[in-house]
Amino acid sequence: FERTRSLQDPCSNCPAGTFCDNNRNQICSPCPPNSFSSAGGQRTCDICRQCKGVFRTRKECSSTSNAECDCTPGFHCLGAGCSMCEQDCKQGQELTKKGCKDCCFGTFNDQKRGICRPWTNCSLDGKSVLVNGTKERDVVCGPSPADLSPGASSVTPPAPAREPGHSPQ
């Protein structure tokens, strides 16, 4: 099939990083600067994305792959392919229309992005609060009060709070 295809269409032999140049008898020509072709058999090369303004270059454009952008420091990506940059806040805050605001009592945010979420309600699982929540950290639930009989050995300390999550960009 490949052989038949190439007999019928000489452009199918042009690899990624080149284009089939109609102006030169369908010779495979390299993509010009600032352009790329990520698949073979292309009749044109696509222009590279520019990472300007609030965007910065995460991966340079090559002859076979487009540039990839992320956001300048203090911002994080939103949308497909990092199509918008949103301001970071501190842990313990969320971004509102008025800027970064501290989480209300009873909520927390352990990341620089996203919204404040309510503390876990330990009693729903029949447990007690072992470590109080803060604006930056959820509560840590321990065994139920009934499990803590008088004179029982001390409770094993909780594992350290997890590091802030980082969403893939």
């Epitope: 696509d46 520019q50 965007f55 300048t72 918008m84």
Partner: antibody
Framework: QVQLQQWGAGLLKPSETLSLTCAVY????????WSWIRQPPGKGLEWIGE???????DSNPSLKGRVTFSVDTSKNQFSLKLNSVTAADTAVYYC?????????WGQGTLVTVSS | EFVMTQSPATLSVSPGERATLSCRAS??????LAWYQQKPGQAPRLLIY???TRATGIPARFSGSGSGTEFTLTISSLQSEDFAVYYC?????????FGGGTKVEIK
């Protein structure tokens, strides 16, 4: 809420310099890029250019170097100057915040160039 | 520069009906496209970014699709407040460019 408020002279004669300022209220000023866009009466939108808090700029080549941007971070303001105006520069001029797309816009200022 | 072409120039639709607006880029822009709504005497308002992500506070009846060179904005059931002019804009490459707009009017 982030608000952009703009002002400047609304009536100019040919060859004069257009001057507009945009103030940003609420939210952060530094880190963002701040843009100017114009819209001739009854027509579409044209990007003029942009500036950030540290004064880094980019502009539309179609304006052939007639445009100057400036920023005053102490007041959270940025400005546009367009020199040697002609009737073709008559438009509503908007300031906007650039986060990739333009997510917040000023109210617009109609600038008329007439002799 | 990247040229953005919108069609149709005017779209006549009855309230409650579906509206489909098209935007074509002169070269591939991946999904780095925004849609705006503009009402008379007002500044444009961001509806969609990244070709398909609704901006904060935008009703679910607005949806965007497409990638490469062909893009669509769909308003599933037109409300009276949706009659306006809609613009697409690419921010894949500088200078930033807008389409000529599609006016959605009452049929």
């Amino acid at each position: 809420q982030v608000q952009l408020q703009q002002w400047g002279a609304g009536l100019l004669k040919p060859s004069e310099t257009l001057s507009l300022t945009c103030a940003v209220y609420g939210g952060s000023f530094s880190g963002y890029y701040w843009s100017w866009i114009r819209q001739p009466p009854g027509k579409g939108l044209e990007w003029i250019g942009e500036i950030n808090h540290s004064g880094s700029t980019d502009s539309n080549p179609s304006l052939k170097g007639r445009v100057t941007f400036s920023v005053d971070t102490s007041k959270n303001q940025f400005s546009l100057k367009l020199n040697s105006v002609t009737a073709a520069d008559t438009a509503v001029y908007y300031c906007a915040r650039l986060t990739g797309p333009f997510d917040y816009w000023g109210q617009g200022t109609l600038v008329t160039v007439s002799s | 520069e990247f040229v953005m072409t919108q069609s149709p120039a005017t779209l006549s639709v009855s309230p409650g009906e579906r509206a489909t607006l098209s935007c074509r880029a002169s070269q591939s822009i991946s999904s780095i496209l925004a849609w705006y709504q503009q009402k008379p005497g007002q500044a444009p308002r961001l509806l969609i970014y990244g070709a398909s992500t609704r901006a904060t506070g935008i009703p679910a009846r607005f949806s965007g699709s497409g990638s490469g060179t062909e893009f669509t904005l769909t308003i599933s059931s037109l409300q009276s407040e949706d009659f306006a002019v809609y613009y697409c804009q690419q921010y894949y490459n500088w200078p930033l460019t807008f389409g000529g707009g599609t006016k959605v009017e009452i049929k």
